[in-house]
C-alpha cells in the first residue's frame, strides 16, 4: 500500500543505542565541575502533572464517598424493609409498632454491648500504646552508621546458612584460581630470570668463562 | 371473581411438620395482606396468622408464635403456612383469607374452601 | 385478649321472621366489628364489617349495629338460604378474636 510506505519514510529514524562509556569517564565527571543537569520537565508540565494527580485523587476520593452511600443504603435497605401498611388495620399497625420497638430495644441492647466492648478495646489499646512508650524510654537506640558491605556479606544476611554452602563453594574456587595464577606467575618469573642473566654482564662473563 | 384454593392437608402424628399452600386468583394478589384461620372440630374459628403485602410483616398468636410460619410468593399469587411442632390441638381445617380493613377495621373479606389436617397418634 | 361473646349458641326461627344476633366484647372496640356467615357446606363469607358496613354482595336483608361493647346482626324477612351458623370477629387487637358462633336453624 503506498500510504504505508510513505507514513513510514516520514517516521523519525530511530536514535542509536547509548554508548557505552567506560568507568574512567564517570569517575571523571564526577570529581570535575560541571553545570547542573537541566531538568527535563519544564515547570509549567510539572504544575500540570501535579493538578492531573490531584484530579484523579479527588475523583477516586469521591468515588470512594460514593461507594460508601451505596454500602448504606444496601445496608439500610436489608435491615429497614419498606413500610406495607396498605391492607393492615388498626390491630395489625399496634402489633406492628409493638414488634418495632422491640426491634429497637433489642438492637440498643447489641449497640450498648458493642460500645462497651470497643470502650475497652480503646482502653486495652491505650494501656499497650503506654507500655511501648516507656519500652522505648528503657532502651536508647544506637545511632545507625552506614555501612560498607560485601555482596557475600550481604548474601549472608539475606540468605542466612542456605547461603553459607554456596559462599563456601565460591571461595574455594577462587582459592585454586588464586594458586593456579601463583603457580604461573613464579614459572613466568623463573623464566625471565634466565633470560635476564644470560643477556646482562653475568652472562657475558659465565660466556667468557666458558 | 375472588378465588382461593388451599392445598397440602393431611394427616400427621404429634411433632410433625407440614406446609399448607394456598393459590390465589381474581385480584391483584400483591396488593393486599392475607391471612391463615382454622376451625377446630368443635367449630371454633381461630386466625393462625397474617402477612402484609409484600410479606416483610407477619402476625401470629402466641399459641402458633415460633411454631407456624407464614410466608408469600406474590410472582406465583401462592400462600404458605409451615407448620412444625405439630399438636394434637392444631387439628382444625385450615382456611386462607384475603385480608382487608376499612377505617382500621381489620377483616377477612374473601376465604377459601378450607384443607383438613389432623394430628394424631 | 379481647374475649368475644354471643348470647345464645344456637337460635330457632321461621322464614320470613326477623332474627337479631348478639355479641359482646370483653372491652371496647370502637366499632371494629364483622360478621361472618358459614354455609352447613363449610364455605365462609363476610357480611358485615367495621358494625354495619354491608360487604359487597351481600343482600340488604343482613344490617349490622352496635358500639363499644355491645353489637348486633339483624336478618330481616328469613330465608331458607340464610340457615347457617354465624360468627362476629374484633379487629381491633391483636390477637384477632371470633365468638363461638350461634347456629340459626328452622323452627
Known amino acids: 500500500m503506498a500510504d504505508g510506505s510513505s507514513d513510514a519514510a516520514r517516521e523519525p529514524r530511530p536514535a542509536p543505542a547509548p554508548i557505552r562509556r567506560r568507568s574512567s569517564n564517570y569517575r571523571a565527571y564526577a570529581t570535575e565541575p560541571h553545570a547542573k543537569k537541566k531538568s527535563k520537565i519544564s515547570a509549567s508540565r510539572k504544575l500540570q502533572l501535579k493538578t492531573l494527580l490531584l484530579q484523579i485523587a479527588k475523583q477516586e476520593l469521591e468515588r470512594e464517598a460514593e461507594e460508601r452511600r451505596g454500602e448504606k443504603g444496601r445496608a439500610l435497605s436489608t435491615r429497614c424493609q419498606p413500610l406495607e401498611l396498605a391492607g393492615l388495620g388498626f390491630a395489625e399497625l399496634q402489633d406492628l409498632c409493638r414488634q418495632l420497638h422491640a426491634r429497637v430495644d433489642k438492637v440498643d441492647e447489641e449497640r450498648y454491648d458493642i460500645e462497651a466492648k470497643v470502650t475497652k478495646n480503646i482502653t486495652e489499646i491505650a494501656d499497650l500504646t503506654q507500655k511501648i512508650f516507656d519500652l522505648r524510654g528503657k532502651f536508647k537506640r544506637p545511632t545507625l552508621r552506614r555501612v560498607r558491605i560485601s555482596a557475600d556479606a550481604m548474601m549472608q544476611a539475606l540468605l542466612g546458612a542456605r547461603a553459607k554452602e554456596s559462599l563456601d563453594l565460591r571461595a574455594h574456587l577462587k582459592q585454586v584460581k588464586k594458586e593456579d595464577t601463583e603457580k604461573e606467575n613464579r614459572e613466568v618469573g623463573d623464566w625471565r630470570k634466565n633470560i635476564d642473566a644470560l643477556s646482562g654482564m653475568e652472562g657475558r662473563k659465565k660466556k667468557f668463562e666458558s | 371473581e375472588v378465588q382461593m384454593v388451599e392445598s397440602g392437608g393431611g394427616l400427621l402424628k404429634p411433632g410433625g411438620s407440614l406446609k399448607l399452600s394456598c393459590a390465589a386468583s381474581?385480584?391483584?394478589?400483591?396488593?393486599?395482606?392475607m391471612s391463615w384461620v382454622r376451625q377446630t372440630p368443635e367449630k371454633r374459628l381461630e386466625w393462625v396468622a397474617t402477612?402484609?403485602?409484600?410479606?416483610?410483616?407477619?402476625f401470629y398468636p402466641d399459641s402458633v408464635k415460633g411454631r407456624f410460619t407464614i410466608s408469600r410468593d406474590n410472582a406465583k399469587n401462592t400462600l404458605y403456612l409451615q407448620m412444625l411442632s405439630l399438636r394434637s390441638e392444631d387439628t382444625a381445617m385450615y382456611y386462607c383469607?384475603?385480608?382487608?380493613?376499612?377505617?382500621?377495621?381489620?377483616?377477612?373479606?374473601?376465604w377459601g374452601q378450607g384443607s383438613s389436617v389432623t394430628v394424631s397418634s | 385478649d379481647i374475649q368475644m361473646t354471643q348470647t345464645s349458641s344456637s337460635l330457632s326461627a321461621s322464614l320470613g321472621d326477623r332474627v337479631t344476633i348478639s355479641c359482646r366484647a370483653s372491652?371496647?372496640?370502637?366499632?371494629?366489628l364483622n360478621w361472618y356467615q358459614q354455609k352447613p357446606d363449610g364455605t365462609i363469607k363476610l357480611l358485615i364489617y367495621?358494625?354495619?358496613r354491608l360487604h359487597s354482595g351481600v343482600s340488604s336483608r343482613f344490617s349490622g349495629s352496635g358500639s363499644g361493647t355491645d353489637y348486633s346482626l339483624t336478618i330481616s324477612n328469613l330465608e331458607q338460604e340464610d340457615i347457617a351458623t354465624y360468627f362476629c370477629?374484633?379487629?381491633?387487637?391483636?390477637?384477632?378474636t371470633f365468638d363461638t358462633g350461634t347456629k340459626l336453624e328452622l323452627k
Open positions: 372491652q371496647d372496640i370502637t366499632n371494629y
Open positions: 367495621y358494625t354495619s
Open positions: 402477612i402484609s403485602s409484600g410479606g416483610s410483616y407477619s
Open positions: 370477629q374484633q379487629g381491633h387487637t391483636i390477637p384477632l
Open positions: 381474581g385480584f391483584t394478589y400483591s396488593n393486599y395482606a
Open positions: 383469607a384475603r385480608r382487608d380493613n376499612y377505617f382500621g377495621s381489620t377483616f377477612m373479606d374473601y
